[in-house]
Interface confidence: low
């Protein structure tokens, strides 16, 4: 017989992974010179599962979803030169710098630190 | 140098998986006799990624989240006997019977069919 719901283990031969991958990010703004910066992106495969509902519900809904997202990030100012705009010769862009990533509940707000 | 954001491909070496696993589900209701039914649950590892934001935004936000959830399910009536309730000798419960599963956008409403 198949296992009951509470024995539906996340199989040990499959492991969740969520990594901070190094990327080159292009920061741009209309009419300004783009800048390339080194940053990180989160990429991975986290576990999710969905167990059937009943109505009326007899137990709490067994739906679980983790997503690979920033576990820690901070905002950094990147100043772009805008040679064609005499009145606005430069523009400051806020860039999210990702520090590290982890599998977290889908829909969770990312954790940001100050500049 | 690391690849630019738009080259951050999901490498074919890691493949997403999302399966319908056979389970034994206990359908219960207060004061009624529980029933065991055969059902399926969705379990898997889908891809998710999160690329850093800028503010003001220069491109669309590159956040992607897939979750393993029912791709097709239907509601089925399971009747429970309630011997201690003379005025309500039986209770009908609606049970979600999962047909098959797939990686779908996190937060997407599952696709249900009629009874």
């Amino acid at each position: 017989a198949p296992p009951p719901i509470n024995k539906l283990a996340l199989f040990p031969d499959k492991s969740a992974w969520c990594e901070a991958k190094n990327i080159t990010q292009i920061v741009g703004h209309s009419g300004c010179e783009a800048k390339s910066i080194q940053n990180r992106a989160c990429l991975g495969q986290c576990f999710s599962y969905s167990v059937p509902n009943t109505f009326p519900q007899s137990t709490e809904s067994l739906v679980h979803c983790d997503s690979c997202m920033p576990a820690q990030s901070m905002w950094e100012i990147v100043t772009l030169e805008c040679p064609g705009h005499e009145e606005v010769p430069r523009v400051d862009k806020l860039v999210e710098k990702i520090v590290h990533c982890s599998c977290q509940a889908c829909g969770k707000e990312p954790s940001h630190e100050g500049l | 140098a690391p690849p630019p954001i738009n080259k951050l491909a999901l490498f074919p070496d890691k493949s997403a998986w999302c399966e319908a696993k056979n389970i034994t589900q206990i359908v219960g209701h207060s004061g009624c006799e529980a029933k065991s039914i055969q059902n399926r649950a969705c379990l898997g590892q889908c891809f998710s990624y999160s690329v850093p934001n800028t503010f003001p935004q220069s491109t669309e936000s590159l956040v992607h989240c897939d979750s393993c959830m029912p791709a097709q399910s239907m509601w089925e009536i399971v009747t429970l006997e309630c011997p201690g309730h003379e005025e309500v000798p039986r209770v009908d419960k609606l049970v979600e019977k999962i047909v098959h599963c797939s990686c779908q956008a996190c937060g997407k409403e599952p696709s249900h069919e009629g009874l």
């Epitope: 901070a20 | 690849p3 491909a9 490498f11 070496d13």
Partner: antibody, heavy 118, light 112 residues
């Protein structure tokens, strides 16, 4: 700087065992794959297998499955290629390379020459 | 396994002239994510291979812009707009869509 440094040349006899190494530095060792590529004398490149040190996920070419073992120790940022019983036909240059998945091997080791002769 | 073929196998070129190498795969290398899983590598005499082009058409870091990759599906081309003496060596294409990745036999570029 980002580099992969391989262990030195080896001369072995048939039937002997061998483990060669590839040490990564200057980058996050667990965030990329490490592949092994064979080049027999005067010949082309052959893909042997690949490992993701982050979770030790390992893939082998069917031609090399059971002939070699690929492993990694992420605590010292080192990947390994080993043989339990060498044959004369294992004589070749072996390269390790950093991959983005199975594609884009962007950093290569200097190669380890393995000579098997009685 | 996916079989890779290259032509020509030998390519004598005069410095300053363009050069073109063709690579064909026995099945499509276009993944559902839109990328062609084909790389180009150059192995200079006595050296380790080096990445030139990845995912079909993306030049690797530090590779001169005289190198370009094109093509999709099963037919790919590496072009050198103006060959220089330092470009001599063996050029390999490699498919990475199917395990195991497989290399072409190589094209030996030499200076006339």
């Amino acid at each position: 700087q980002v580099q992969l440094v391989q262990s030195g040349a080896e001369v072995k006899k048939p039937g002997e065992s061998l483990k060669i190494s590839c040490k990564g530095s200057g980058y996050s060792f667990t965030s990329y794959w490490i592949g092994w590529v064979r080049q027999m004398p005067g010949k082309g490149l052959e893909w042997m297998g690949i490992i993701y040190p982050g979770d030790s996920d390992t893939r082998y070419s069917p031609s090399f499955q059971g002939q070699v073992t690929i492993s990694a120790d992420k605590s010292i940022s080192t990947a390994y290629l080993q043989w339990s019983s060498l044959k004369a036909s294992d004589t070749a240059m072996y390269y390790c390379a950093r991959g983005h998945g199975a594609t884009a091997f962007d950093i290569w080791g200097q190669g380890t020459m393995v000579t098997v002769s009685s | 396994d996916v079989v890779m073929t290259q032509s020509p196998l030998s390519l004598p070129v005069t410095p300053g002239e363009p050069a073109s190498i063709s690579c064909r795969s026995s099945q499509s290398l276009l993944h559902s994510n839109g990328y062609n899983y084909l790389d180009w590598y150059l192995q200079k005499p006595g050296q380790s291979p080096q990445l030139l082009i990845y995912l079909g058409s993306n030049r690797a870091s530090g590779v001169p812009d005289r190198f370009s990759g094109s093509g999709s599906g099963t037919d790919f081309t590496l072009k050198i707009s103006r060959v220089e003496a330092e470009d001599v060596g063996v050029y390999y294409c490699m498919q990475a869509l199917q395990t195991p990745p497989t290399f072409g036999p190589g094209t030996k570029l030499e200076i006339k």
